[in-house]
Amino acid sequence: VPPGEDSKDVAAPHRQPLTSSERIDKQIRYILDGISALRKETCNKSNMCESSKEALAENNLNLPKMAEKDGCFQSGFNEETCLVKIITGLLEFEVYLEYLQNRFESSEEQARAVQMSTKVLIQFLQKKAKNLDAITTPDPTTNASLLTKLQAQNQWLQDMTTHLILRSFKEFLQSSLRALRQM
């Protein structure tokens, strides 16, 4: 069960409720574990993880990425700008996580867990950011057409897209985790 779900909070006796910071930290680490499992299947199934042709597939993708201006790196750190970027980025990743849902055979449940846990993480972070400026949500129509476009790709591009989504999501979460520990 992901750490954000209700059953975890009533866990073992003597376990006090998780604090907001601990919840967020545990949730990100849980998702990262899930991504590792999915990457393992992807890399075992194809040679995408060693491929040098990533740029071809990356042209079709607009995956969220941390940049200096987002304020999440040690250099130029800005906690409020950064938190908004983390939430916005996670919301933008949701369509790509939806795409992943039919891309795994033995790890189908893991892909679902990553998707659901990310939704829970977004909720935790939105609570933390309650005093910050409104966060823009991706347009559902744009997301729907992106999903259709990704699903219409040939097999090689779909495999490469899966690999790139997992790699980018992992990098985004790792940067987020480092920054959130300061907050």
Epitope: R15, F77, E79, E80, R178, R181, Q182
Partner: antibody
Amino acid sequence: EVQLVESGGGLVQPGGSLRLSCAASGFTFSPFAMSWVRQAPGKGLEWVAKISPGGSWTYYSDTVTGRFTFSLDTSKSTAYLQMNSLRAEDTAVYYCARQKWGYYALDIWGQGTLVTVSS
Amino acid sequence: DIQLTQSPSSLSASVGDRVTITCSASISVSYMYWYQQKPGKAPKLLIYDMSNLASGVPSRFSGSGSGTDFTLTISSLQPEDFATYYCMQWSGYPYTFGQGTKVEIK
């Protein structure tokens, strides 16, 4: 040299107030969260409070919540601990500590400043 | 709050000895740290995130463990290692510390 220097400690009566300062030098102050940790004479360490790098989030131990306030002046690379309604049990050496970037470890500590609460 | 219990509270050892200090948590913790403190000085970070050696710390120090049980090991005690050692955990706020283990010269 990376350094934290605390000041502002001293003798104060129960119910009184004191403001501690922690001046940082040798590193860029702005990206780091800071904490205060105290140590009563001859006793162990007790975490008191944390502030995020921009001051948006503060955390306090139950023993000081409502009495102590942690703040920052990033232009001066200085952290402050405003201590009100002081009690005898607040008597301790107060250390400020920097939180390691990307981790929860407290990696750089000041030399400490002694606060004595007594009538 | 999470309680940390260190054992032993104090120990006597000789230079060159292998020293092991344990830290037991009341419930599973997310991150564990070890500090060294000498009289009249500030604590010094030795180990972070269970087993990572802090910058400038000699390799004779090592940390291990997970869940509720953690260990600090000094493989070959040196004269400068006589001090008090504290474990500290973070699993959300507050951070909590063990009561300390004093390592004295035999």
